[in-house]
Interface confidence: low
């Protein structure tokens, strides 16, 4: 009735001291290696010559933290990073902050970077639309308060405003081009 | 919309803490930091910590040895306390949201 | 990093142009500015020097760079009756400014 070695399960290390012979209903926990964390019961318990129960551990670290454009991160970067690891981030100049500076390795996902926005409020080339261009010469940065306006492709009709604004680093909404109805 | 109720006493006792507690609403503790601030008539607005989305926190130097902020993001609180508290703390003492870069968009009503 | 307002106290009659100046002990990245009234807590007003705060009007403006930082309103009124206060967090601890108390003629 009693029990021999102790079964072995992945990234599971047994605790306390190993014996070569566990009586009838003696516990043995298992504790994680590092970057698991225990999933369900920890133990395992001697019963009729067969241990019973089934420790799991679950990988719960996270790789790669999140890519945040015009920004760097300023904490020690790590191939695999445990849970509850946190890494901080900096924008690079001249864009701002927007959001929480840090993010947090939380059981296998990362919790939401932050963004880094033009502070001054520039803008990146209209958005194009279908059938339509603008009428001007597209620029690579437009600063804010600047508007361009859009022109529609022969037989297709103008629906909402022609001229968009530059507003906090945003376009305001384009029109569309539509095909008229032909009856 | 997003808001922060802050709740605590309003008066200490010399030499006591002081504890506030700041519930959120309409934003996750989870993605956002949160602020302590305190204003006087003597010193002006004065920051005291955050605490981050992911837990940490970062205490102005003149008050580390006697502040500590956490929080439970299951619960939508931010816990402040101050310990040691003299006649000049009294001040009216604020939570308020990270907006970036340590600045703060929404505040809380105020403890005096 | 100390920043010192000027000035602390000032009266304006509506329409007339105001500027605020903040100066600060050493350089920093950026300033953001707060209006607080009597008995309300303060309120995000102009961050990151330059960009409006949601439902700022238009009035208002900021600039600078360096070590010195302006809040200008192109034309007071009366609802513009305000403390304002500056605030940099190029370096911790984040610090503010003493404060501008506006008030109307």
């Known amino acids: 009735t009693d029990c021999l070695s102790l079964p072995s399960f992945e990234n599971a290390i047994p605790m306390g001291e190993k014996k070569d012979v566990y009586k009838a209903g003696e516990q043995v926990t298992y504790t994680c290696a590092t970057y698991y964390k225990m999933d369900g019961a920890s133990n395992v318990t001697c019963i009729n010559s067969r241990w019973t129960g089934r420790p799991t551990c679950r990988d719960t670290s996270c790789v790669n933290p999140p890519t945040v454009q015009n920004a760097y991160i300023v904490s020690r970067q790590m191939s695999k990073y445990p849970s509850g690891e946190r890494v901080r981030y900096q924008c690079r100049s001249p864009y701002e902050m927007f959001g929480d500076e840090e993010v947090m390795c939380l059981n296998g996902n990362w919790t939401e970077p932050p963004q880094c926005k033009d502070s001054t409020g520039k803008c990146g080339p209209p958005p194009p639309i279908d059938n339509g261009d603008i009428t001007s010469f597209p620029l690579s940065v437009y600063a804010p308060a600047s508007s361009v306006e859009y022109q529609c492709q022969n037989l297709y009709q103008l629906e909402g405003n022609k001229r968009i604004t530059c507003r906090n680093g945003q376009w305001s909404e384009p029109p569309k081009c539509l095909h008229p109805c032909v009856i | 919309q997003v808001q922060l109720q802050q709740s605590g006493p309003g008066l200490v006792q010399p030499s006591q803490s002081l504890s506030i507690t700041c519930t959120v609403s309409d934003f996750s503790l989870a993605r956002y930091g949160v602020h302590w601030i305190r204003q006087s008539p003597g010193k002006g607005l004065e920051w005291l910590g955050v605490i981050w989305s992911g837990g940490t926190a970062d205490y102005n130097a003149a008050f580390i040895s006697r502040l500590n902020i956490n929080k439970d993001n299951s619960k939508s609180q931010v816990f402040f306390k101050m310990n040691s508290l003299q006649a000049n703390d009294t001040a009216i003492y604020y939570c308020?949201?990270?907006?970036?870069?340590?600045?703060?968009?929404?505040w809380g009503q105020g403890t005096s | 990093i100390v920043l010192s307002q000027s000035p602390t106290f000032l009266s304006a009659s509506p329409g007339e142009k105001v500027t605020v100046t903040c100066r600060a002990s050493s350089s920093v990245k950026y300033m953001h500015w707060y209006q607080q009234k009597p008995g309300a807590s303060p309120k995000p007003w102009i961050f990151?020097?330059?960009n409006l705060a949601s439902g700022v009007p238009a009035r208002f403006s900021g600039s600078g760079s360096g070590t010195s930082y302006s809040l200008t309103i192109s034309r007071v009124e009366a609802e513009d009756a305000a403390t304002y206060y500056c605030?940099?967090?190029?370096?911790?601890?984040?610090?503010f400014g003493n404060g501008t108390k506006l008030e109307l003629k």
């Open positions: 605030q940099q967090w190029s370096i911790i601890p984040p610090t």
């Open positions: 308020a949201r990270n907006f970036g870069n340590y600045a703060v968009d929404y």
């Open positions: 990151a020097t330059s």
